[in-house]
Interface confidence: medium
């Protein structure tokens, strides 16, 4: 019979022959022959391969370097890499999470829309009309202006996105 030019899924062509790929978590030791199956071996303790493969070496698990503020979010297996995240108070600088930076603060006039996590920075939003923030914070939202009416007072100074309104007593009309 004619030697194959293409192989089925999870197979590879070598020496005019279709051999089985090694399953995830295993590496190739020797190709199949006319008489023997592909020989595979499990990856070592701190290694992995995440696809059907013909790799002769497994990949090393990622190291979450505590000196860069990293910690293990999910321990690697023979089939998956280790996932790193940042220590509390810090977040990843990239999707690969190779280092961490401190969460940023929202400036006055802006409030926190979403508190930062290990993988995302603080999300700030401008304080809309009726709200203000006079602080620099990674935690505080915009606060509503004080309602002078509910205190039986009147607005003496309008609020801004950075300042609260100033309330004062109502002018009494003399009889």
């Amino acid at each position: 019979p004619e030697p194959p030019t293409a192989c089925r899924e999870k197979q590879y062509l070598i020496n005019s022959q279709c051999c089985s790929l090694c399953q995830p978590g295993q590496k190739l030791v020797s190709d199949c022959t006319e008489f023997t199956e592909t020989e595979c071996l499990p990856c070592g303790e701190s290694e992995f391969l995440d696809t059907w493969n013909r790799e002769t070496h497994c990949h090393q698990h990622k190291y979450c370097d505590p000196n860069l503020g990293l910690r293990v979010q999910q321990k690697g297996t023979s089939e998956t890499d280790t996932i790193c995240t940042c220590e509390e108070g810090w977040h990843c600088t990239s999707e690969a999470c190779e280092s961490c930076v401190l969460h940023r603060s929202c400036s006055p006039g802006f409030g926190v829309k979403q508190i930062a996590t290990g993988v995302s920075d603080t999300i700030c939003e401008p304080c809309p009309v009726g709200f203000f923030s006079n602080v620099s914070s990674a935690f505080e939202k915009c606060h509503p202006w004080t309602s002078c009416e509910t205190k039986d007072l009147v607005v003496q100074q309008a609020g801004t996105n950075k300042t609260d309104v100033v309330c004062g007593p109502q002018d009494r009309l003399r009889a």
């Epitope: 930076v101 401190l102 603060s105 006079n134 602080v135 620099s136 914070s137 935690f139």
Partner: nanobody, 119 residues
Framework: EVQLLESGGGLVQPGGSLRLSCAAS????????MIWVRQAPGKGLEWVSA????????YYADSVKGRFTISRDNSKNTLYLQMNSLRAEDTAVYYC????????????RGQGTLVTVSS
Amino acid sequence: EVQLLESGGGLVQPGGSLRLSCAASGFTFSTYDMIWVRQAPGKGLEWVSAISPNGTGTYYADSVKGRFTISRDNSKNTLYLQMNSLRAEDTAVYYCAKPPQVNTEFDYRGQGTLVTVSS
């Protein structure tokens, strides 16, 4: 000029307590979050705790939760860290810091105060 000056460090036995202080000047202290970070010998910086400008929001790393308490006195421009049930692994230089507006490491941090937990 922004200045942060830590004090209160020292040698303490495991299980003991210390209270760190940080005197701030050169900026409007009451309008900023403040944080404590620490650096153990040969290690990187570790975030310890944070407090919101008015002191109502406090946040802690898992490693110190339930043992450390952060507080502030805006009338005195001072930040505090009460450390109880101290462990050997708490040994480090402790810094108070003003967090960044952008993604730099810190806007400012102090010179630090050394806490040594040993019997």
